[in-house]
């Protein structure tokens, strides 16, 4: 059997890739099934008319070439066509109708625009399952896509609108990727995803959504990616009926709270990722803590870390005690108990919680003060922390545990005057350890240090509020204060003066 001299032929696999070819070589054997022609300089003129006679060819790799039109003269029974990284601008019915058995079409990194896809171009493509159009020039989703499509990738285009009808017939679609486009909520036609009854994965990462989309298909959606948008609102019905959803990611948005019960329908959720949102841990978010504490072990929730108000900044929502949510109508006030070894005059904390004090403040209304814990009794997992400023940029943290623990989460945060200021650093320390040296801090700056037991379960039997302490790094002239905090040393609770 012949093989073009510039190629290598091996049992139906024809390797003509990376040869600087400007045309497809003549003499490809008739039993060829796969043509590797990638990484050449083949242009449209260089596709010979007799290529269509190779009726056994099922896969053609023509990516990274010099095609500026959709190629013609392709073998009729081709199933996989890889045309990435060319300069193809148009998709016509004439070219697609000649390869009606196509199942996968890879057109990533070309120059296809919405107007350059001929209306009805895909009307005879009744076997097409995968259509990849990432990194093209699309401003909208092309209409008239075949209803056989199972995966549609349109990431990194310029899509600002999706028309209601464009996706409506795609009842076989399982995976839709729209990352890195220009979509806002106005650009999403009404019920645009609603009829995608087999959709299991929807990705809208890196767009301009300000609200989580509604009317999502509930029958089969399993993964929903909404990270890196501008979402500041989740409509109460956004996740209704999404009973199959197991992964939801809304990281890197602008969410400060969530409507109560928003996750009620998510019967199968196992991964909920909400990192890097400005969560405001006020009364509206108390339900989230209660919900988190009721979750089974299999549910993995990440990123619910308070950014405001300042008194709880840096704390995990699930670790907050009920009193810290400031639900004024509940009659609950803070009952955190703190002692300190810092003299009054030495580097007092700057109005952050918990404020180191040396005496109990006056209690205006003792009847209002009640220590509400989930078990009705104080937590027995007492941690006594001592913090010492060793050098202007280093603090030494040591702790004692009343009960043995497998691990603890240690975090520290430079305090500032706005929620956007400062970043939380955390580390996991094993239960056997009793000290930790934090370096590379800023001199003469206030820090909050928190410790909390690391639980293996999300079912809480004790009050797991973090034990926190504030300290200040020494000025460049050396000073070594020592601060001690223990939630259970005080005999009587008192109202935190910094709380309203």
């Amino acid at each position: 059997k012949s093989c073009p001299s510039v190629c290598r032929c091996d049992a139906g696999f024809i390797y003509c890739n990376d040869r600087s070819l400007t045309s497809i070589p003549v003499g490809i054997p008739e039993d060829a099934t796969t043509l590797y022609l990638q990484n050449n300089q083949i242009n449209n003129v260089g596709i010979p008319s007799d290529l269509k006679n190779l009726l056994k060819v099922q896969r053609i790799y023509l990516y990274h070439n010099s095609l500026d039109e959709f190629p013609t003269n392709l073998p009729k029974y081709v199933k996989e066509l890889h045309l990435q990284e060319n300069n193809i601008r148009t998709i016509t019915y004439d070219s697609l109708s000649k390869i009606p058995y196509l199942e996968e079409l890879h057109l990533d990194d070309n120059s296809v625009s919405a107007v350059s896809i001929e209306e009805g171009a895909f009307r005879d493509s009744n076997y097409l399952r995968l259509l990849f159009l990432s990194r093209n020039h699309l401003s909208t989703i092309p209409g008239g896509l075949p209803r056989t499509i199972e995966e549609l990738r349109l990431d990194d285009n310029r899509i600002s609108t999706i028309s209601s009808p464009s996706l409506h017939g795609l009842t076989s679609l399982k995976r839709l990727v729209l990352d890195g486009n220009l979509l806002n909520n106005h650009g999403l036609g009404d019920k645009v995803f609603f009829n995608l009854v087999n959709l299991t994965e929807l990705s809208l990462v890196r767009n301009s959504l300000t609200a989580a989309p509604v009317n999502l298909p509930g029958t089969s959606l399993r993964k929903l990616y909404l990270q890196d948008n501008h979402i500041n609102r989740v409509p109460p019905n956004a996740f209704s009926y999404l009973r199959q959803l197991y992964r939801l990611d809304m990281s890197n948005n602008n969410l400060s709270n969530l409507p109560q019960g928003i996750f009620d329908d998510l019967d199968n959720i196992t991964q909920l990722i909400l990192r890097n949102n400005p969560w405001y841990c006020g009364c509206k978010m108390k339900w989230v803590r209660d919900w988190l504490q009721s979750l089974p072990v299999k549910v993995n929730v990440r990123g619910l870390m308070c950014q405001a108000p300042e008194k709880v900044r840096g704390m995990a929502i699930k670790d907050l005690s009920a009193e810290l949510f400031d639900c004024k109508d509940s009659g609950i006030v803070s009952t955190i108990q703190i002692t300190t070894a810092i003299p009054n005059t030495a580097y007092p904390a700057q109005g952050q919680w918990p404020a180191p004090v040396t005496k109990q403040p006056d209690i205006k209304n003792p009847k209002l003060i009640k220590d509400q814990r989930t078990t009705g009794s104080p937590s027995r997992k007492t941690i006594l922390i001592t913090v010492k400023s060793v050098t202007p940029d280093t603090i030494h943290i040591s702790w004692r545990l009343a009960l043995p623990m497998t691990a603890l989460r240690l975090s520290w945060l430079k305090l500032g005057h706005s929620p956007a200021f400062g970043s939380i650093t955390e580390t996991i320390v094993t239960g056997e350890r009793s000290e930790y040296l934090v370096t590379a801090l800023e001199p003469e700056s206030p820090y909050r240090v928190c410790m909390v037991p690391m639980e293996t379960s999300n079912l809480y039997l004790f009050d797991e509020t973090p034990v926190c302490i504030e300290t200040q790094t020494a000025p460049l002239r050396m000073y070594n204060p020592t601060t001690t905090l223990n939630r259970e040393q005080e005999k009587e609770p008192y109202k935190n003066p910094n709380l309203p």
């Epitope: 107007v115 209601s164 017939g169």
Partner: antibody
């Protein structure tokens, strides 16, 4: 070729209901959305909604929810629109219209229209 | 709902003239716009779809342009048979909405 044949004119009393039909031929009826459009005498066009005969799934203009009910019978390739609780405001010509390619938003094929007159 | 603002509401021109009809959407509809011609007592007829694509059988003197929110229908070399009412339709979002129509008359 695509053809849409609508039922004849209807004279109905206020409060009653009416059923309009649209028989399709020349294409795969189950695969293309069927739209319905209202035109009052001397006035413009209003989109009522569309139905996908393949599974009976319908989408309505909110203005016509409760007023219009769209159904389809695949076996006879016929789409139906029922209008209920009729008032004089419902007196109009009603068109069925098919999209150019199955389910896009432009209507290339139109029925001849059915005139509904609501009068006591 | 997306509003379609069509202007002018009526237009009088001479045979052979070039006329334009404008349609403005209340929000971005990309290229999801079509134009229809309706003669008195007749059904609407598709002229232009996808903002600029001429439908089969429509004379080439009809053309459409625009994207986003602003669209125009142009009829060059006006003919007597062009006397009709013209409508735009947005197909971007449910509910689909028509413009209010432009009635074209011959001077």
């Amino acid at each position: 070729q695509v053809q849409l044949q609508q039922s004849g004119p209807e004279l109905v009393k206020p409060g009653a209901s009416v059923n309009i039909s649209c028989k399709a031929s020349g294409y795969a009826f189950g695969n293309s959305w069927m739209n319905w459009v209202k035109q009052r005498p001397g006035k413009g066009l209003e989109w009522i909604g569309w139905i996908y005969p393949g599974d009976g799934n319908a989408n309505y203009n909110g203005k016509f929810k409760g007023k219009a009910t769209l159904t389809a019978d695949k076996s006879s390739s016929t789409a139906y629109m029922q209008l209920s609780s009729l008032t004089s405001e419902d007196s109009a010509v009603y068109f069925c219209a098919r999209a150019l390619y199955d389910y896009d938003g432009w209507f290339a094929y139109w029925g001849q229209g059915t005139l509904v007159t609501v009068s006591a | 709902d997306i509003q379609m603002n069509q202007s002018p509401s009526s237009l009088s021109a001479s045979l052979g003239d070039t006329i334009t009809i404008a349609c403005r959407a209340s929000q971005n509809i990309d290229i999801w716009l079509s134009w229809y011609q309706q003669k008195p007592g007749s059904i609407p007829k598709l002229l232009i779809y996808k903002a600029s694509n001429l439908h089969t059988g429509v004379p080439s003197r009809f053309s459409g342009s625009g994207s986003g929110t602003d669209f125009t229908l142009t009829i060059s070399s006006l003919q007597p048979e062009d006397i009709a009412t013209y409508y735009c339709l947005q197909g971007q979002s449910f509910p689909f909405t028509f413009g209010s129509g432009t009635k074209l008359e011959i001077k």
